[in-house]
Interface confidence: low
């Protein structure tokens, strides 16, 4: 008769909540005489899971008939697994003794870990917008998964990113785990239509990773480029001043016209032209009547974009000497 070995072939058993778990245990010898019991954990505080001879274990059934004379299979099945069932299970051989049985040999143990899918990744962007060439951070969070091994990748417009940091918590044993990853993305002027994607792969997903996305449009501010032009004189001494605000995002923009420092009109961008890259253009006109102007007119256009400090662009409208004479005549 060979020396007794307690064989628990699975080191790790992954089980989903509600499923049944089969814990395998076979022995290589019928001797010494005595029962095989199942415990969760080790030491004095270990929990009895199954004892064929005594006790009531409604969720536990044996795989084989333990009453059979030459039975060497002591595997058990636990039904309706809950998170509380996680732990390492040992089949333990006891030597029959008096007044009580004495522990003889333990199997190496099977760790039962819950197999739980990660939640859909949630990607959040920065609290405030940033301008191109600045770096912004995106955070991806997923939780509730087990086992702990998980792979997370970041993509921008389908291209894999490398500048990110990932943490899985907790570090030690747990019923389930969560992952948090922060990616750093350098903004480009054309990123209004860009998207970042967080991709999570886990053993429970059977090769079909979960994805969460965020639009860079929520994180970027593209400041406008400003251009002011003066159209040729019209009949009736009118000048058409055109103010072009180009390539800005978001569309929240306010424009104020000042004539010699005095506000003459304020307007909020409404009829915008959208560019291919997602930025906007807007044109504003001001008709200035120069017939009653005695001195040169300083026209200032003040643009306030997305709550930022106003940007000014000025134009000096020169009044001709002839007009100045006429104007001075009129004042006499």
């Amino acid at each position: 008769e060979e020396e007794l070995q307690m064989i628990q072939p699975e080191k790790l058993l992954l089980v989903a909540v509600g499923e049944s778990a089969t814990l395998n245990c076979t022995v290589t010898s019928l001797l010494p005489v005595g029962p095989v019991l199942w415990f969760r954990g080790v030491g004095p505080g270990r929990e009895l899971i199954y004892n064929q001879k005594e006790g009531h274990f409604p969720r536990v059934t044996t795989v084989s008939d333990l009453t059979k004379r030459n039975n060497m299979d002591f595997s058990i099945r636990i039904s309706s697994i809950t998170p509380a069932d996680a732990g390492t299970y040992y089949c333990v051989k006891f030597r029959k003794g008096s007044p009580e049985n004495v522990e003889f040999k333990s199997g190496p143990g099977t760790e039962m870990a819950l197999r739980a899918k990660p939640s859909a990744p949630v990607v959040s962007g920065p609290a405030a917008r940033a301008t191109p060439e600045h770096t912004v951070s995106f955070t991806c969070k997923s939780h509730g998964f087990s086992p702990r091994d998980i792979t997370l990748k970041w993509f921008k417009n389908g291209n894999e990113l490398s500048d990110f940091q990932t943490n899985v918590d907790p570090a030690g044993q747990s019923v389930s785990y969560s992952i948090r990853s922060t990616a750093r993305v350098v903004l480009a002027p054309w990123d209004v239509r860009s998207q970042v994607t967080c991709e999570v792969a886990h053993v429970t997903l059977q090769g079909d990773p979960l994805r969460g996305t965020a639009n860079l449009s929520e994180a970027i501010r593209v400041p406008p480029t400003l251009e002011v032009t003066q159209q040729p004189m019209r009949a009736g001494n009118q000048v058409n001043i055109t103010y072009q605000v180009r390539n800005f995002y978001p569309q929240n923009l306010q424009l104020t016209w000042l004539e010699n420092g005095n506000v003459c009109r304020t307007e909020t961008a409404s009829t915008l032209t959208e560019n291919k890259d997602g930025t906007y253009n807007w044109t504003s006109w001001l008709l200035v009547n120069t017939s009653d102007q005695r001195d040169d007119v300083v026209l200032t256009c003040q643009v306030k974009h997305d709550g930022q400090l106003a940007v000014n662009k000025s134009l000096v409208l020169e009044v001709s000497a002839h007009q100045k004479d006429q104007s001075s005549d009129a004042t006499h």
């Epitope: 072939p9 080191k11 790790l12 190496p108 760790e111 792979t151 792969a201």
Partner: antibody, heavy 118, light 107 residues
């Protein structure tokens, strides 16, 4: 940096026993399991068994049952593998390897050549 | 026990080219598969675990895929230091078992 340093080469006669040691440094010894893997000259890798330094639990491949014993000394962070009843086909390089997540081997010792010859 | 079979036994590839190594399990090991590289006179070195996760310090040219019984190790652009013997190992069930190895040699 984790390091596993094994004992030196051994020459043994058939029927004798050999005990190879593996000293771990740079990590928490009791947190990880250790396996022993051997490689006969010009051959592949063969897993022999594992042991848990914390509990002393062991598990051996069926082929080595009854001939192999794995023990540990937690005070020196050393694991041992003893193979008895040596035969010429036991000539191999014996590696100790640290188990990560009780699964794959992330650190390996440099190997110990055991030659069994009469 | 689960038997791991690697193919081909020897693979001849030119530097800069792609190498594809296969590993088959006699029964499903889910994604519990690791790959190792071994050079002459050295201990094996962990490359990939969990089928596709690169170990610390392993270059991105190494990638793993597969699940169940069929697995692949791909080296996208072979460097001179990549010519070695490669082993797969399953850890879904004891005893842990290795494939017999694929020798990657310079063409």
């Amino acid at each position: 940096q984790v390091q596993l340093v094994q004992s030196g080469a051994e020459v043994k006669k058939p029927g004798a026993s050999v005990k190879v040691s593996c000293k771990a440094s740079g990590g928490t010894f009791s947190n990880y399991g250790f396996s022993w893997v051997r490689q006969a000259p010009g051959q592949g890798l063969e897993w022999m068994g594992w042991m848990s330094p914390s509990s002393g639990n062991t598990g051996y491949a069926q082929k080595f049952q009854g001939r192999v014993t794995m023990t540990r000394d937690t005070s020196t962070s050393t694991v041992y593998m003893e193979l008895s009843s040596l035969r010429s086909e036991d000539t191999a390089v014996y590696y100790c390897a640290r188990e990560r997540s009780g699964s794959y081997f992330d650190y390996w010792g440099q190997g110990t050549l055991v030659t069994v010859s009469s | 026990e689960i038997v791991m079979t690697q193919s081909p036994a020897t693979l001849s590839v030119s530097p800069g080219e792609r190498a594809t190594l296969s590993c088959r399990a006699s029964q499903s090991v889910s994604s519990y598969l690791a790959w190792y590289q071994q050079k002459p006179g050295q201990a094996p070195r962990l490359l990939i675990y969990g089928t596709s996760t690169r170990a610390t310090g392993i270059p991105a040219r190494f990638s793993g895929s597969g699940s169940g019984t069929e697995f692949t190790l791909t080296i996208s652009s072979l460097q001179s230091e990549d010519f070695a013997v490669y082993y797969c190992q399953q850890y879904g069930s004891l005893p842990f078992t290795f494939g017999q190895g694929t020798r990657l040699e310079i063409k």
